[in-house]
Interface confidence: medium
């Protein structure tokens, strides 16, 4: 493929470098299965370039196809604990606006203490992503064990 | 979003296509938990475009936010073996320069024989990434079972 | 890095935004271990921009380095089921043309009911990717549990 021929040029701004990597802040109160996230250079290696946090949930600012990835490690966990407290499940989804609510990614822990996955999905400006952890086990807040991020890939 | 309006154009070179995918070469001597990697077309499907290998460890050549990913499969492993030899842990981190030393990604095998994960993280020119496998089990050298890579995502 | 200096400009078309995210359609007949995929906006959140489906298998249209990712969840599965039906293995590979046939990514389920991984790999126009699930357990067709995708990363 030749790179210098086509007339239509790509301005830097429109590349839509939207990207975010978040670390766990805290879990929700009793009946709220959501994980609450935080990001920013003062916190370590987390950041938001484009997307924003809205009460600990990630809000998208640019339409496009995104790579969404997550890793969650359970705290004070062994394979015995994990299986005894089964089912512990992590789901990532669009939780608002309600009209676009959908589960994007779901994993159960079974006999493991960590889940990690990623997927491509279309997201629209204003979509808020929620990560729901159901079960009685708590997630680790270590920044190398539990994190959640998105990367804009194409329009 | 319109793509042809903005004045600022993006030269190809500055896109920073830095990317690498490595295959396992060997494990370290007795007291060295590091995995030693290799890459290049002669070896199969591994490659380095930008980053370099320094004594089997991956060194970054361009500042930016990177997607780091890894999969490690234990050799001579069953779920019984994995749990009997627990804890076997894999950690990816910046190991040099010492001033920037930090763990980026950590996973335990528990009752499984494979771990796989990925994350976004800022890396700087000169950062060297090390992958430490602690425990008594050995990793598989099969190129479809054990691999480690980075992809430059944005400045 | 300065972005506006270099003379060589990057046309939008040549960025090669090739990307696909697929959902499971069905498994193959008795002796065929392949998973058959489907994609398109009418089906939900799956899509193909560049690559195409050929009898349920993904065919690449643009040379380059791709990020390949997959998640497969077994249906009607518990850690007991998974270990009793072991080995259940998922392999992603180039299955045609035959001259380029190779396994790219392989994972066993052991005591878990989900595998998820990703890797960077060079692919060429005409390469067809197959995903082989060996074992007696069936995959879930839920779109948030089982999916397969590729993303063009660089030439």
């Amino acid at each position: 493929q030749r790179f210098a021929q086509a007339q239509q040029q790509l301005p830097l701004e429109s590349l839509g470098w939207d990207v975010a990597e978040l670390q766990l802040n805290h879990t929700g109160p009793q009946q709220d299965p959501r994980l609450y996230w935080q990001g920013g250079p003062a916190l370590g290696r987390s950041f938001l370039h484009g997307p924003e946090l809205d009460k600990g949930q990630l809000r998208i600012h640019r339409d496009g196809i995104y790579m969404v990835h997550i890793q969650v490690t359970l705290a004070i966990c062994s394979s015995t604990t994990a299986s005894r407290h089964h089912p512990t499940t992590l789901a990532v989804g669009i939780c608002s606006p309600a009209s676009r609510s959908i589960s994007l990614l779901r994993l159960s822990f079974h006999q493991g203490c960590t889940i990690a996955s990623q997927r491509l999905t279309p997201l629209a400006r204003g979509d808020t992503l929620c990560t729901n952890l159901t079960g009685t086990l708590l997630p680790s807040r270590n920044t190398d064990e539990t994190f959640f991020g998105v990367q804009w890939v194409r329009p | 979003q319109r793509f042809a309006q903005a004045q600022q154009q993006l030269p190809l070179e500055s896109l920073g296509w830095d990317v690498a995918e490595l295959q396992l070469n060997h494990t370290g001597p007795q007291q060295d938990p590091r995995l030693y990697w290799q890459g290049g077309p002669a070896l199969g499907r591994s490659f380095l475009h930008g980053p370099e290998l320094d004594k089997g460890q991956l060194r970054i050549h361009r500042d930016g936010i990177y997607m780091v990913h890894i999969q490690v499969t234990l050799a001579i492993c069953s779920s019984t073996t994995a749990s009997r030899h627990h804890p076997t842990t894999l950690a990816v981190g910046i190991c040099s320069p010492a001033s920037r030393s930090i763990s980026l990604l950590r996973l335990s095998f528990h009752q499984g024989c494979t771990i796989a994960s990925q994350r976004l993280t800022p890396l700087a020119r000169g950062d060297t990434l090390c992958t430490n496998l602690t425990g008594t089990l050995l990793p598989s050298r099969n190129t479809d079972e054990t691999f480690f890579g980075v992809q430059w995502v944005r400045p | 890095q300065r972005f506006a200096q270099a003379q060589q400009q990057l046309p939008l078309e040549s960025l090669g935004w090739d990307v696909a995210e697929l959902q499971l359609n069905h498994t193959g007949p008795q002796q065929d271990p392949r998973l058959y995929w489907q994609g398109g906006p009418a089906l939900g959140r799956s899509f193909l921009h560049g690559p195409e489906l050929d009898k349920g298998q993904l065919r690449i249209h643009r040379d380059g380095i791709y990020m390949v990712h997959i998640q497969v969840t077994l249906a009607i599965c518990s850690s007991t089921t998974a270990s009793r039906h072991h080995p259940t293995t998922l392999a992603v590979g180039i299955c045609s043309p035959a001259s380029r046939s190779i396994s790219l990514l392989r994972l066993s389920f052991h005591q878990g009911c989900t595998i998820a991984s990703q890797r960077l790999t060079p692919l060429a126009r005409g390469d067809t990717l197959c995903t082989n699930l060996t074992g007696t357990l069936l995959p879930s067709r839920n779109t948030d549990e089982t999916f397969f995708g590729v993303q063009w990363v660089r030439p």
């Epitope: - | 234990l74 050799a75 001579i76 024989c113 050298r141 099969n142 479809d144 | 080995p87 066993s108």
Partner: nanobody, 121 residues
Framework: EVQLLESGGGLVQPGGSLRLSCAAS????????MGWVRQAPGKGLEWVSS????????YYADSVKGRFTISRDNSKNTLYLQMNSLRAEDTAVYYC??????????????WGQGTLVTVSS
């Protein structure tokens, strides 16, 4: 159901010989690489030897090279390990296993129950 069943273990004097067999069922034996792995009392697993599907390529750990011979009979779905010049340090439970690939240290996805080999005078 995929199964591997070892036999041929037992007590043997140093310098003696034994032949281990492994009967495979439930999969296409001839298309799979196979291997032998052992576990000495109180020790971890140690790879011993492996062989590709056709039987043309064989691999051995340094500790057994020249003394052990791996072979297979695809018509009988059976894997063998001929062990000569046995030493006390060869005492272990020997497992037959189906391999993921041909590398000496590649993963195993099916294991037998193991057969005990004791080398003692």
């Amino acid at each position: 159901e995929v199964q591997l069943l070892e036999s041929g273990g037992g007590l043997v004097q140093p310098g003696g010989s034994l032949r281990l067999s492994c009967a495979a069922s439930g999969f296409t034996f001839s298309s799979e690489a196979m291997g032998w792995v052992r576990q000495a009392p109180g020790k971890g697993l140690e790879w011993v030897s492996s062989i590709n599907g056709s039987g043309r390529n064989t691999y051995y750990a340094d500790s057994v090279k020249g003394r052990f011979t791996i072979s297979r009979d695809n018509s009988k779905n059976t894997l063998y390990l001929q062990m000569n010049s046995l030493r006390a340090e060869d005492t272990a439970v020997y497992y037959c296993a189906r391999k993921h690939g041909e590398y000496y240290d590649s993963g195993y996805d099916v294991w037998g129950q193991g057969t005990l080999v004791t080398v003692s005078s």
